[in-house]
Amino acid sequence: ELCDDDPPEIPHATFKAMAYKEGTMLNCECKRGFRRIKSGSLYMLCTGNSSHSSWDNQCQCTSSATRNTTKQVTPQPEEQKERKTTEMQSPMQPVDQASLPGHCREPPPWENEATERIYHFVVGQMVYYQCVQGYRALHRGPAESVCKMTHGKTRWTQPQLICTGEMETSQFPGEEKPQASPEGRPESETSCLVTTTDFQIQTEMAATMETSIFTTEYQ
């Protein structure tokens, strides 16, 4: 089941999904002056079995001025992500998100991709919030949001995070990269009220994106 809305926005904070649940789709979008190759994939899809998840399909962009003479091919996600996990082994790195059953890593960059990535999340997806540089976190609870199905409708839980402008000289409290858990924390809410937050769509993207069969935006 796809999530209807975008995760909520918090002032002076930004969010990311550290891993993507199976069923997540990522649109293959190209930046201005480039387009998907003919017969190229419209989207990547996180698929897998009980032991391994990966992105099906590859996004490929080519210059709009050429006739597919130069194909720009994305690196194999599995290949890149394997390098990612073996090259960077240190205590400051959290538990490898790729080890989450039923989840895919962030696909590596592909040549001439669009600025924004348009993901289509599924129920159970979690995103994690951090205060941006120059702000520090005041936690009232988990700095995360999970897409849940409630009474037949999807909604994102509200992250309990406030970012205050008190500058820290080095690290910012509350900014540690989270260890993702596949399922969201249980909530005490029982109301069926569904709240949505409009995602701030950057106008530049609207001007540069080619028309897509999908519309939900997440960067």
């Epitope: 990311k16 669009a114 910012f172 995602f199």
Partner: nanobody, 130 residues
Framework: QLQLVESGGDLVQPGGSLRLSCTAS????????IGWFRQAPGKEREGVSY????????YYIDSVKGRFTISSDIAKSTVYLQMNTLKPEDTAVYYC???????????????????????WGKGTLVTVSS
């Protein structure tokens, strides 16, 4: 295949300067944080500096503040690390890396410090010794 290619590493005397380059042809800069990590022999890799392609905001690890400067030339698909007043403790292999920005084109320095990047270069060696 999109790759990160570093150059500029060398042997330099303490107090000297170097400029590292990282070229990422085809990378859509304004969707990423791009910058540098380093790993000294027997030590953990650490995030040195990054610049965001969306708005040019920068980050430096405390030990290099005031000595290192990161910049980018999007037309050349290249990020630079100008390293001045080099010290022996700056000796390391320097790796270029990129990480996807968060929502609204913003980025949190903790993501860089975690070292969990989307793409890595092969590294260039900087040796500071007399």
């Amino acid at each position: 295949q999109l790759q990160l290619v570093e150059s500029g590493g060398d042997l330099v005397q303490p107090g000297g300067s170097l400029r590292l380059s990282c070229t990422a042809s085809g990378l859509t800069f304004d969707g990423y944080a791009i910058g540098w990590f380093r790993q000294a022999p027997g030590k953990e890799r650490e995030g040195v500096s990054y610049i965001t392609g969306s708005n040019g905001s920068t980050y430096y690890i405390d030990s290099v503040k005031g000595r290192f400067t990161i910049s980018s030339d999007i037309a050349k698909s290249t990020v630079y690390l100008q390293m001045n007043t080099l010290k022996p403790e700056d000796t390391a292999v320097y790796y270029c890396a990129v990480d996807r920005l968060g929502s609204r084109g913003l980025y949190a320095s903790s993501w860089w410090r975690s070292g969990d990047m989307d793409l890595w270069g092969k590294g260039t060696l900087v040796t500071v010794s007399s």
